[in-house]
Structure formats: structure tokens, C-alpha cells
């Protein structure tokens, strides 16, 4: 599984380094779950055709994925700090079931799919820790949560490969534009 | 194969306008993050604008804002620098280019470039 | 705004020799730095990013090294199609910035 941010080579022949702000673990946090994200994506795009797929709304329908939208805040148009940060820990804590589906969908990636959801579950946490507005933030309802994840496994093969690409591939984005954003604040 | 073709540019008058198109082929603009860049005549290369594919989001150079505008038909494949109140300043070739699809945001496809001169 | 200071501006040297460019954030970037070499008259074009992984195509005479503040692109064997000017480019935040530009030129 890769290294955690924090516990690369560089930083532990680094002691003397300055300890990362706040911002900058965030980045880090995120930057590592990208790079999870991405080997993620290969092993998906090698085993099907799906990358290349034009038949993506087919799945999308099923899907209510996090998405960002002008409204949020997180633009450079119209940009707002408590409003995007309370939409980015929101995306996220709507992001984890779609993590949990993920787990058991990877054949040689299956711990870097682990890392990916655990590293996200710290990143949230990292963003909580930032946000004034905690009470603004909704949190995903756990039966509607377990119901979406029954759905989605009980989908046939061709709909669940589809289903895990359009997961990577929404969450890459939805990560981007937070990297994006955050470093606006 | 996978290509940016240009056009768009000439001599204009201080606080003119002028539009650039950057028609792509080999690749949809609708799931790829573009920029454009430009340079000066002798001199490096400056960043003016992104357009993300993910909710049509837009950035821009300082030195820009409020004057230039990116936008993208998608039918047509094709993105477009709108820029306004142009000035001396803005003299230069403009190039069309693509971010590659990682997180590292490097530029793995460029346009020939168009110059666009302001001068009275 | 980071700003990205290459060194140095102009540099001479001959067919097989080994050189280094080097470009300086103002501030750490981790390992978001792209090379690009530039020839007159014509658009960049990517060499490498992430600050080590060479684009595909790319001879591998020409690798990347660094992270934080201070990244190195070297040419193990210059080759005659390789004298261009070569920019550095920090994608940490925007606006995205690149450096001044590095002329490597025949001695």
C-alpha cells in the first residue's frame, strides 16, 4: 500500500523540516488520495472498455454523486470560504458510501482502494477541524446509505464496472476543484 | 490524432475586441481541462486563463480579469478566448493547450499559437 | 503569486555534453513542476512533470530531480536537436506560473 502523507522517505531523513501547516496537510491529504485515485483508475481502464464508454448515462442515472455547482462558493466566480468548505466536507461524507462500494471491486489494487477510503475519512476530519460552521454540514442518512449499497451491488456486472469508473472519475473531479478552492482560503 | 487548430488573431486598436477559437479534434473538449497561454514577443510564457471541464468552472490571470472571457461549444468541440479592452500589453501569441488528465496539471497538447497584435 | 527563477538565463554547451538547468519556487510546490523546451517559432512541448516522470516520447537522456523549492532538469548527452529555450512551470496554485525561460545555446 503507498506511504500516508507525512511518512515518505524525504520526510523521515527530514526531521529538522517545519512542521506542515494546516493547509498544507490538507493538500498533501488530498494529493495522496489523488494518486490513489489514479492507480485506481488504471486498473479499472485496463480491465474494461469503460474509460472509453459513451454509454455513461445509462449508470449515471443510478447515481446521485457529489458534484460542485457555481451556488457552492468554490469557483473563482462567486467565490465563498464557510460556504465551499461546508459543501467540500459535505461532498465528502456523501463521497463515502460510494467508497464503501468500491472496497472488494479491486483484484491487485484492493489496498490502495482502502487507502483511498481511509485516507479520506482522515481528510474530512482535517477540513472539520478548519470549519467554523460545523452545524451547516449534513451528514448522510446511514439506512439511506445502506440501502444505496445494496442497490448498487445487486447491479449487473456490466452496470457495476460502470458504476465503480464514474465513482473514480467524479471523485477525482470533485477532489480537484476542492484542491482548487482550498487553495483560495 | 490528437490536435488544436487555431485561429483568430490579427492587428487591433487599443481597447478592441477579438475572439480566438481553438477547434480540437482527436479528443472532446467536454471532458478535458483546457488554458490558454501567451507570450510576448522575446519573451516566456504567461498563463491567462483555464477552462475545467467539471461544472464549466473558469480561471484567470490577474492581468486579464474582467476583460478576457473562455468559453466552449461543446458541438463544435471548440473553446474560445473572448478578450475585450485590449492594450498594448496584450500583444502576443496566444496558444490553446490542454492539461493533461492528471492531478499534476501539466500541458500535454498545445495549438500552434495565433498572434494577436495591439497597436494603433 | 509563486514566483519561479530559472538559472541560469543562457547557457552554452556542445553536442554529448551533460547539462543542468535549474528553476527556484518561491515558496514549496512539493512536486508540482513541469519542464517544457520551446523552439523559435514553434509551441512548447511537455517533457516532463511531477518533477521526475518523463511525458511519453521523451528521450530518456532527459530526467527531472527536486521537490519544495528547488528542481533540476538535466540532458545526460546533448543531442543537436535539443538546443531550445526550456521553462519551468509550478502548478501548485494559480496562477499557474512559469519560469523566465532557460536559452541553451551551441558553443
Known amino acids: 500500500a503507498p506511504v500516508p502523507p507525512g511518512e515518505d522517505s524525504k520526510d523521515v531523513a527530514a526531521p529538522h523540516r517545519q512542521p506542515l501547516t494546516s493547509s498544507e496537510r490538507i493538500d498533501k491529504q488530498i494529493r495522496y488520495i489523488l494518486d490513489g485515485i489514479s492507480a485506481l483508475r488504471k486498473e479499472t481502464c485496463n480491465k474494461s472498455n469503460m474509460c472509453e464508454s459513451s454509454k455513461e448515462a445509462l449508470a449515471e442515472n443510478n447515481l446521485n454523486l457529489p458534484k460542485m455547482a457555481e451556488k457552492d462558493g468554490c469557483f473563482q466566480s462567486g467565490f465563498n470560504e464557510e460556504t465551499c468548505l461546508v459543501k467540500i466536507i459535505t461532498g465528502l461524507l456523501e463521497f463515502e458510501v460510494y467508497l464503501e462500494y468500491l472496497q472488494n471491486r479491486f483484484e491487485s489494487s484492493e489496498e490502495q482502494a482502502r487507502a483511498v477510503q481511509m485516507s479520506t475519512k482522515v481528510l474530512i476530519q482535517f477540513l472539520q477541524k478548519k470549519a467554523k460552521n460545523l452545524d451547516a454540514i449534513t451528514t448522510p442518512d446511514p439506512t439511506t446509505n445502506a440501502s444505496l449499497l445494496t442497490k448498487l451491488q445487486a447491479q449487473n456486472q456490466w452496470l457495476q464496472d460502470m458504476t465503480t469508473h464514474l465513482i473514480l472519475r467524479s471523485f477525482k473531479e470533485f477532489l480537484q476543484s476542492s484542491l482548487r478552492a482550498l487553495r483560495q482560503m | 490524432q490528437v490536435q488544436l487548430v487555431q485561429s483568430g488573431g490579427g492587428l487591433i486598436q487599443p481597447g478592441g475586441s477579438l475572439r480566438l477559437s481553438c477547434a480540437a479534434s482527436?479528443?472532446?473538449?467536454?471532458?478535458?481541462?483546457m488554458v490558454w497561454v501567451r507570450q510576448a514577443p522575446g519573451k516566456g510564457l504567461e498563463w491567462v486563463s483555464d477552462l475545467y471541464y467539471y461544472a464549466g468552472d473558469t480561471y484567470y490571470a490577474d492581468s486579464v480579469k474582467g476583460r478576457f472571457t473562455v468559453s466552449r461549444d461543446i458541438s463544435k468541440n471548440t473553446v474560445y478566448l473572448q478578450m475585450n479592452s485590449l492594450r498594448a500589453e496584450d500583444t502576443g501569441v496566444y496558444y490553446c493547450?490542454?492539461?493533461?488528465?492528471?492531478?499534476?496539471?501539466?500541458?500535454?497538447?498545445w495549438g500552434r499559437g495565433t498572434l494577436v497584435t495591439v497597436s494603433s | 503569486d509563486i514566483v519561479m527563477t530559472q538559472s541560469p538565463s543562457t547557457l552554452s554547451a556542445s553536442v554529448g555534453d551533460r547539462v543542468t538547468i535549474t528553476c527556484r519556487a518561491s515558496?514549496?510546490?512539493?512536486?508540482?513542476l513541469a519542464w517544457y523546451q520551446q523552439k523559435p517559432g514553434r509551441a512548447p512541448k511537455a517533457l516532463i512533470y511531477k518533477a521526475s516522470t518523463l511525458e511519453s516520447g521523451v528521450p530518456s537522456r532527459f530526467s527531472g530531480s527536486g521537490s519544495g523549492t528547488d528542481f533540476t532538469l538535466t540532458i545526460s548527452s546533448l543531442q543537436p536537436e535539443d538546443f531550445a529555450t526550456y521553462y519551468c512551470?509550478?502548478?501548485?496554485?494559480?496562477?499557474?506560473?512559469f519560469g523566465q525561460g532557460t536559452k541553451l545555446e551551441i558553443k
Open positions: 482527436g479528443f472532446t473538449i467536454s471532458s478535458n481541462y
Open positions: 512551470q509550478q502548478s501548485y496554485s494559480t496562477p499557474w506560473t
Open positions: 515558496q514549496g510546490i512539493s512536486s508540482w
Open positions: 493547450a490542454r492539461w493533461a488528465d492528471d492531478h499534476y496539471y501539466h500541458i500535454d497538447v
